[in-house]
């Protein structure tokens, strides 16, 4: 195994030694420790946790552990002027008000500083008006409302159910539709799995539970006031009017008990089809406004949150590499939570803590990795990936020259059914090989490999006998590393059975009920799934930092590039006449993909045969592998999204959580039949094909023999 050939190696100090040192009981203890009080970004409690982690990582044996602070824009409710929503009668009297807080879970009644549910970065305002129900507030939902049902949301307050897409996209869509306020709610159809009790008796969302979350549309900018640059002591800050990604209309989240009170009175149009109906006992009428008896009643929002520049703290730990200290493998996950963070993020932070401890143990015994490993505890992820982005902005020159890989470590679990991996194609073979060596924790797969249970439960849609690996999207701290800097990235966690559980995320996501007990009682009592995730994340970091030849296979990129080219061509061929009229051809892209495939194949042959004892040639080959991901970066970025620079992947313009392939071409084609100037629109399609074809060809040439 390549990892046996690391420096200062004794038979004891190999991947097995690292993996064997990881203990479920430790992860459990760390999770308990990290979840007893809230750790909201920008608060004293989260600063204290940062210092605790710094101290413990030093004790574990890292070479150095530093705090990196930034002053970024955050958002908080007004403690003396709470946010709520009312139904008002014709006299303006409030006849119903939504709740001001979630009922605290058992054992947490006396905990202070539980932030009430709010939509971070909502502007202040008290709009009142008629309600329109907009389903999930997706692009296609507004198309249905506006184009098919001829319902105008202008000047209305819209109510949307959480799920399917990132909440910031919902708010953006509502703004574009002319809405003057947005109410977000959790429908039991999406956040209450059948046959499971609500917390504290099960893992389902109670009626008073509410999902917090930011509603920004940052598109990778980081701190809204300092896009592109770190929010340091001498930063120039934009005025709030020029800040990136802030919503322009008030937004507030509620639970399904309160949603019932708003939705039961809805009149106007019936829902267009069954996909617009949730599970509440309400008609799911679209509106606008309330039905006959209640037609004079209106909805009023009362939002008083404030945006404040606040100090945040990342913890950065270093384990110096013995042979290539200037090559960085990064393991990072966030520390800040909305409340207790039982799953998000502390189930991930506890795993990182145990991985650091295991690496530290090996280091104390005289071992070092071949390459430098950086460990990060990011702050303010919940407020827009701010900690990771500011640190990467500050260190961008180092990272773009030295960054080998980034492994993300947010929530370790969102279910307990099977593994879920999203990563660059360069890591497919690494993930496959690693999971074949790990034991499955799943019932019914005793003595079988993780690869086997994963493949059985989550098969690849394209390749039989292989597991599904998804594209990276965003909504987590890998974003800046992958989408902006072009550093090979991956993430892994245990997930639910998507076939049988159609709810979005996990039911208690970002609620006060995301506690240690939720995990310990209902998700992973033995912490065996956490341990497996630690083995996957830690094993990936170990191999990336220690193998003599980087464990990247460029041939897998060739395969997906062909798949993505076929897909975007198929989308374009929906418009055969326009393709003909405007002479749109994908020949250049298919030619570039063909060249990439041939060059990648030849590179892989050379990789098998070269003299690994020659450090110059070894470094040269490894640099070609390291810089391949970087070669997909377009310095000009995507149209109107300058910080999304990866030409092959970007977060979907319609759902930040999802990844889109050839996003430049995809967005140019999207809804093209509605564009007022088809010639201009198809010209942009042609330009994007040109950019994509050039980028793929240029990336291919980085794998050619250097002379």
């Amino acid at each position: 195994k390549s990892s046996n050939e690391a420096t200062n190696i004794t038979p004891k100090h190999n991947m097995k030694a690292f993996l064997d040192e990881l203990k479920a009981e430790n992860i459990k203890k760390f999770l308990y420790n990290f979840t007893q009080i809230p750790h909201l970004a920008g608060t004293e409690q989260n600063f204290q946790l940062a210092k605790q982690i710094q101290s413990q990582w030093k004790e574990f044996g890292l070479d150095s552990v530093e705090l990196a602070h930034y002053d970024v824009l955050l958002s908080y409710p007004n403690k003396t002027h709470p946010n709520y929503i009312s139904i008002i009668n014709e006299d303006g009297n409030e006849i119903f008000n939504t709740s001001l807080f979630e009922p605290p879970p058992p054992g947490y009644e006396n905990v202070s500083d539980i932030v009430p549910p709010f939509s971070a970065f909502s502007p202040q305002g008290m709009p009142e008006g008629d309600l329109v129900y907009v389903n999930y507030a997706r692009t296609e939902d507004f198309f249905k409302l506006e184009r098919d049902m001829k319902i105008n949301c202008s000047g209305k307050i819209v109510i949307a159910r959480y799920g399917k897409v990132f909440r910031g996209n919902k708010v953006k869509n509502a703004q574009l539709a002319g809405a003057k306020g947005v109410i977000l709610y959790s429908d039991p159809a999406d956040y209450f799995a059948p046959g499971v009790k609500s917390y504290p008796d099960g893992w389902n969302l109670p009626g008073g539970g509410v999902q917090r979350g930011n509603i920004l549309n940052l598109n990778g900018a980081g701190d809204p006031l300092t896009p592109g640059y770190p929010a340091n002591e001498y930063a120039y800050r934009r005025g709030i009017a020029e800040a990136v990604g802030l919503p322009s209309i008030p937004v507030h989240p509620i639970g399904y008990y309160d949603a019932q009170k708003l939705l039961e009175k809805m009149g106007g149009s019936a829902p267009p089809d069954s996909s617009w109906r949730g599970s509440l006992k309400v008609p799911y009428n679209v509106g606008p406004g309330f039905t006959g008896n209640f037609s004079t009643q209106k909805v009023k929002m009362h939002i008083h949150s404030t945006n404040e520049v606040t100090r945040i703290y990342n913890v950065i730990g270093t384990l110096r590499g013995a042979v290539e200290p200037d090559r960085y493998v990064i393991l990072g996950g966030h520390r800040d939570s909305w409340v207790f963070g039982g799953i998000d993020p502390q189930s991930g932070a506890a795993v990182v803590h145990e991985i650091v401890r295991s690496f530290g143990t090996l280091k104390k015994e005289g071992w070092r990795p071949r390459r430098t490993i950086l460990f990060a505890s990011w702050d303010a992820e919940e407020f827009g990936l701010l900690g990771s982005t500011e640190w990467a902005e500050e260190n961008s020159r180092l990272l773009q020259e030295r960054g080998v890989a980034y492994i993300n470590a947010d929530s370790s679990i969102e279910g307990n059914y099977t593994l879920r991996v999203d990563c660059t194609p360069l890591m497919y073979s690494l993930v496959h090989n690693l999971t074949k060596e790990l034991k499955s924790p799943d019932e019914g797969f005793e003595g079988k490999s993780l690869y086997e249970s994963w493949t059985k439960k989550s098969p690849s849609p394209e390749f039989s006998g292989m597991p599904r690996i998804s594209k990276l999207g965003s909504g987590n701290d890998f974003e800046v590393f992958f989408q902006r800097l072009g550093i090979a990235s991956g993430r892994a966690r245990y997930t639910k059975n998507w076939e049988t559980n159609k709810f979005s995320g996990y039911p208690l996501y970002h609620s006060v009920y995301e506690t240690y007990e939720l995990v310990e009682k209902f998700y992973d009592p033995m912490f065996k799934y956490h341990l497996t995730v630690a083995q996957v994340r830690g094993g990936m970091v170990f191999e990336l930092a220690n193998s003599i030849v980087l464990p990247f296979d460029c041939r897998d990129y060739a395969v997906v590039l062909r798949k993505y080219a076929d897909k975007i061509y198929s989308i374009s061929m929906k418009h055969p006449q326009e393709m003909k009229t405007y002479s749109v051809s994908f020949d250049s892209l298919f030619s570039a993909v063909k060249n990439f495939t041939e060059i990648a194949s030849k590179f892989s042959e050379r990789l098998q045969d070269f003299d690994k004892s020659n450090p110059i040639v070894l470094r040269m080959m490894n640099d070609q592998l390291m810089f391949l991901e970087r070669a997909f970066i377009d310095p000009l970025g995507l149209p109107d999204r300058p910080f999304y620079r990866h030409v092959i992947y970007a977060p979907s313009s319609h759902n930040k959580y999802a990844g889109e392939s050839f996003p430049g071409i995809y967005d140019a084609l999207f809804d093209i039949e509605s564009k007022v100037d088809p010639s201009k629109a198809w010209g942009e399609v042609k330009r994007q094909i040109y950019v994509a074809a050039f980028t793929v060809q240029a990336a291919a040439e980085t794998l050619s023999e250097v002379a």
Partner: antibody, heavy 118, light 110 residues
């Protein structure tokens, strides 16, 4: 050679459900729209709706919206037209046709006669 | 969108010409050069005869021709033959993946 082969004639009772098919061969099924066209006895052609098999994007003509469902299975190069509850007035010949550049229906299936009678 | 208007019937003797009109609006026939014509013999599937107003697919005799003026398209069959007796339908693209069919014209060869 491009071919659209439709399933056989159907005789059904009112209220019954029905799914008829159109199997394509000789071309890249996923990258051409398929249309379904109704011809009632002694009447003209009416476009019911179209589907793009690659992503199952479906557009219905207003008078057929909610009355029928058009679908496609790209793994077997087949488009479908279905009813959940047939009426006597659904008695007609149903054609599938491929749509290509120039917005034209260049290849047609042989047609399926559906008879709905109690 | 309403169906395109065609005359219910047209006729001519062998060797003569017959012209069928197809009237729409500026949103369909008048707005796009995407009018096509289909021939349907009894009990058979329609067959494409003309596309993009004037173009003929290979295999279609050159006695079939198409034209357009304003919101009205026309199909002319010159040198009428017995096998040309059939129903003829026009169709026009109407934007945003919408299509409109004509009401149909029965051509009789006297």
């Amino acid at each position: 050679e491009v071919q659209l082969v439709q399933s056989g004639a159907e005789v059904k009772k009112p209220g019954e459900s029905l799914k008829i098919s159109c199997k394509a061969s000789g071309y890249s099924f996923t990258t051409y729209w398929i249309g379904w066209v109704r011809q009632m006895p002694g009447k003209g052609l009416e476009l019911m709706g179209i589907i793009y098999p690659y992503d199952s994007d479906t557009r219905y003509s207003p008078s057929f919206q909610g009355q029928v469902t058009i679908s496609a299975d790209k793994s077997i190069n087949t488009a479908y037209l279905q009813w959940s509850s047939l009426k006597a007035s659904d008695t007609a010949m149903y054609y599938c046709a491929r749509i290509t550049g120039g917005y034209l229906f260049d290849y047609w299936g042989q047609g399926i006669l559906v008879t709905v009678s109690s | 969108q309403s169906a395109l208007t065609q005359p219910p019937s047209a006729s001519g003797s062998p060797g003569q010409s017959v012209t069928i009109s197809c009237t729409g609006t500026s949103s369909d026939v008048g707005g796009y050069n995407y009018v096509s014509w289909y021939q349907q013999h009894p009990g058979k599937a329609p067959k494409l005869m003309i596309y993009e107003v004037t173009k003929r697919p290979s295999g279609v005799p050159d006695r079939f021709s198409g034209s357009k003026s304003g919101n009205t398209a026309s199909l002319t069959v010159s040198g009428l033959q017995a096998e040309d007796e059939a129903d003829y339908y026009c169709t026009s693209y109407a934007g945003s993946n919408k299509y409109v069919f004509g009401t149909g014209t029965k051509v009789t060869v006297l």
